[in-house]
């Protein structure tokens, strides 16, 4: 025969632990019912009567199955320069993150204890790894045939472009300048003399340098934070 | 409310080391980061570091890396700055201060520790 | 390290004049720039955080605007308890760094 169900409150066996969702009563020395989450005990069990629960209070909270006399306070409403990432409910406690361009330096249970700015790569190196709300950002030099002409938390090193006469060759801070192609090469019928890169790679916004421009020695300096993040030595 | 309340003044001889506290109250003391902030006589202020008495982080100016050691003594809700190897130069006002939010920005301060290094 | 120049060192006004403190970041700071309002022998006062929102308690008559290198404080109409010196701290990164103060003095 199969084992009856007990129905709470009950005794439980000697050396037994009460079932899932459930609690020991010491008062009433019974397996009683636990509330659920957004929910709190309004009345304890007694050796006749199961739990009582109740739902939390407006900016009150329960996250877990449970039996305390009151949900618990949501935290106080996010300031002015920080991003409500999670509402207050019944069931869970606001949570507060940095405003944007910023991440979680120093967290704490629900938040953070202490944000800076995401490491902004320098000219020369490209982000490798984007920043997240708890991570800062990581930065690499760009590898040769790429290129990041920007101060930025989220560039990446790009591809040169594509020459058929190269007038300026690429560096880790500068994309490669093309020339017009060369009159004495011969050309298809109806080519254009343009001078645009070969390869069909979108085009991005900046402006080319001019010829004139020297080559930038950026990508060789060190690739440390601008500006340091939280608990770095700086350049 | 909050309150950072400082020890009294200081007179050392160079070279000696200094240890000044900050006792807190108002607040839980493991939830706040406590700054270390100093202003010489007739001049701008100086960010000496912070110190989280929570985890023992701590992110010191490198100015003062080789010199500075801030620690706590949680069972009485305060922190420490010990600065060593002093010079006539240290002689200054050292104020605790800490932030609300996660941004640094000090709403709330000690009343500040005269400090003076003279031989 | 980011420097924080802060001009003028000194300025004599009147009650009831209107006073402006400008601060100039080495480098981009967002809009991470606080002002303290600090009288002699006393610990700095938070003024204004976020380059322009006020601190708990703090009179309209104190605003703050700027972004990226360039902050100002602006005091409306001056009154008998602004005379104090005024600092700008960045609140961007490590190290936080102050300018050198504005010292505002009775004409």
């Known amino acids: 025969l199969p084992a009856q169900v007990a129905f709470t409150p009950y005794a439980p066996e000697p050396g037994s632990t009460c079932r899932l969702r459930e609690y020991y009563d010491q008062t009433a020395q019974m397996c009683c019912s636990k509330c659920s989450p957004g929910q709190h005990a309004k009345v304890f069990c007694t050796k006749t009567s199961d739990t009582v629960c109740d739902s939390c209070e407006d900016s009150t909270y329960t996250q877990l199955w449970n039996w305390v006399p009151e949900c618990l306070s949501c935290g106080s409403r996010c300031s002015s320069d920080q991003v409500e990432t999670q509402a207050c409910t019944r069931e869970q406690n606001r949570i507060c993150t940095c405003r944007p361009g910023w991440y979680c330096a120093l967290s704490k249970q629900e938040g953070c204890r202490l944000c800076a700015p995401l490491r902004k790569c320098r000219p020369g190196f490209g982000v490798a790894r984007p920043g997240t709300e708890t991570s800062d950002v990581v930065c690499k030099p760009c590898a040769p045939g790429t290129f990041s002409n920007t101060t930025s938390s989220t560039d990446i090193c790009r591809p040169h472009q594509i020459c058929n006469v190269v007038a300026i060759p690429g560096n880790a801070s500068m994309d490669a300048v093309c020339t017009s192609t060369s009159p004495t090469r011969s050309m298809a019928p109806g080519a254009v003399h343009l001078p645009q890169p070969v390869s069909t790679r979108s085009q991005h916004t900046q402006p080319t340098p001019e010829p004139s421009t020297a080559p930038s020695t950026s990508f060789l300096l060190p690739m440390g934070p601008s500006p340091p993040a939280e608990g770095s030595t700086g350049d | 409310q909050v309150q950072l309340v400082q020890s009294g003044a200081e007179v050392k001889k160079p070279g000696a080391s200094v240890k000044v506290s900050c006792k807190a109250s108002?607040?839980?003391?493991?939830?706040?980061?406590i700054h270390w902030v100093r202003q010489a006589t007739g001049q701008g202020l100086e960010w000496m570091g912070w110190?989280?008495?929570?985890?023992?982080?701590?992110n010191y100016n490198e100015k003062f890396k080789d010199r500075v050691t801030m620690t706590r003594n949680t069972s009485i809700s305060t922190a420490y700055m010990e600065l060593s190897s002093l010079r006539s130069e240290d002689t200054a006002v050292y104020y605790c201060?800490?932030?609300?939010?996660?941004?640094?920005?000090?709403?709330?301060w000690g009343q500040g520790t005269t400090v003076t290094v003279s031989s | 390290d980011i420097q924080m120049t802060q001009s003028p060192s000194s300025l004599s006004a009147s009650v009831g004049d209107r006073v402006t403190i400008t601060c100039k970041a080495s480098?981009?700071?967002?809009?991470?720039v606080a002002w303290y309002q600090q009288k002699p022998g006393k610990a700095p006062k938070l003024l204004i955080y976020?380059?322009?929102t006020r601190h708990t308690g703090v009179p309209s008559r104190f605003s703050g605007s700027g972004s990226g290198t360039d902050f100002t404080l602006t005091i409306s109409s001056l009154q008998p308890e602004d005379f104090a010196t005024y600092y700008c701290?960045?609140?961007?990164?490590?190290?936080?760094?102050f300018g050198q103060g504005t010292k505002l003095e009775i004409k």
């Open positions: 201060a800490r932030h609300e939010g996660p941004y640094v920005y000090f709403d709330y």
């Open positions: 108002g607040y839980t003391f493991t939830e706040s980061i």
């Open positions: 110190f989280y008495p929570g985890s023992d982080n701590i």
């Open positions: 480098q981009d700071v967002s809009t991470a």
């Open positions: 976020w380059t322009s």
């Open positions: 701290q960045h609140h961007y990164s490590t190290p936080y760094t």
